[in-house]
Interface confidence: medium
């Protein structure tokens, strides 16, 4: 059985403050079943950015329809970027359970925020 891969193709993304940032993530397999979550930062201090299953994430939208059968694209778009959004974002696959178990993280995409040109 091929090992699941979580692919974040861009090592870094740079956007101007006020613009939107697209963070790409795909998985190599639909198995095992379980959700994808996005975090900023790693370790215990990481921030939950997007969780399709629950919560309200008003500035984040899924690029593809994550509820669509056989969807393997879990890229997100974050709107109205501010300097406080800078950091490294990780796409993380979980195995469905009670609670869900973290399986694999992408390599991360560093988001840098430029001052908006005046």
């Amino acid at each position: 059985e091929e090992e699941l891969q979580v692919i974040q193709p861009e090592k870094s993304v740079s956007v101007a403050a006020g613009d939107s940032a697209t963070l790409n993530c795909t998985v190599s397999s639909l198995i095992p079943v379980g959700p994808i979550q996005w975090f900023r930062g790693a370790g215990p201090g990481r921030e939950l950015i997007y969780n399709l299953k629950e919560g309200h994430f008003p500035r984040v939208t899924a690029v593809s329809d994550p509820t669509k059968r056989n969807n393997m694209d879990f890229s997100i778009r974050i709107s109205n970027i501010t300097p406080a959004d800078a950091g490294t974002y990780y796409c993380v696959k979980f195995r469905k359970g009670s609670p869900d178990v973290e399986l694999k993280s992408g390599a991360g995409t560093e988001l840098s925020v430029r001052a908006k040109p005046s």
Partner: antibody
Framework: DVQLVESGGGVVRPGESLRLSCAAS????????MNWVRQAPGEGLEWVSR????????DYAESVKGRFTISRDNSENTLYLQMNSLRAEDTAVYYC????????????WGLGALVTVSS | ETVLTQSPATLSVSPGERATLSCRAS??????LAWHQQKPGQAPRLLIY???RRATGIPDRFSGSGSGTDFTLTISSLQTEDSAVYYC??????????FGGGTKVEIK
Amino acid sequence: DVQLVESGGGVVRPGESLRLSCAASGFSFSSYAMNWVRQAPGEGLEWVSRINSGGGGTDYAESVKGRFTISRDNSENTLYLQMNSLRAEDTAVYYCAKQYDWNGFFDYWGLGALVTVSS
Amino acid sequence: ETVLTQSPATLSVSPGERATLSCRASQTVGSKLAWHQQKPGQAPRLLIYDASRRATGIPDRFSGSGSGTDFTLTISSLQTEDSAVYYCQQYYYWPPYRFGGGTKVEIK
């Protein structure tokens, strides 16, 4: 409906400790960063501390750093503020506030808990 | 650190009249500014976020405008129940989160 209910306030002497709790309901508590904001009598609002959704990331105002500790229990939907080495200037109403998203404003506030530090 | 300065400190307005409150930031905060209302003896309540978006359940007599460093909260036709202190909050740079010093709106 979102509800935030603080408890644990009271009167203490300088140097003593107190722990505030904030019971949350009506939303997915574990998905949101939470904050404590205080208001001294007759004064404005002062942000005190923030904790991220998972509980592993914390920030503090300089005025309380090293004395106050924020924590949360996501299984119990409860936010805490452990206040040690209390000073007269910590006298205030302490509000628990939910954050709209990880980098955002405060969209819901509790009713507040009064902490009085007096000898 | 971003400092928010609110003016005037106190505003006295007759019922039905327009009230205009100002919040100025010491450096740009984009559109990342919220307004909170605090009535005497009560907790704050969110009115406006992202400079101009009304929070759920807020009457349309409240409106926000501005971006960058200069922001305005307007109450188009003041009601007696609008007597309160109004605070602006920036969330462009943090920590710390910063509030303005407040504007007290009194009914004439």
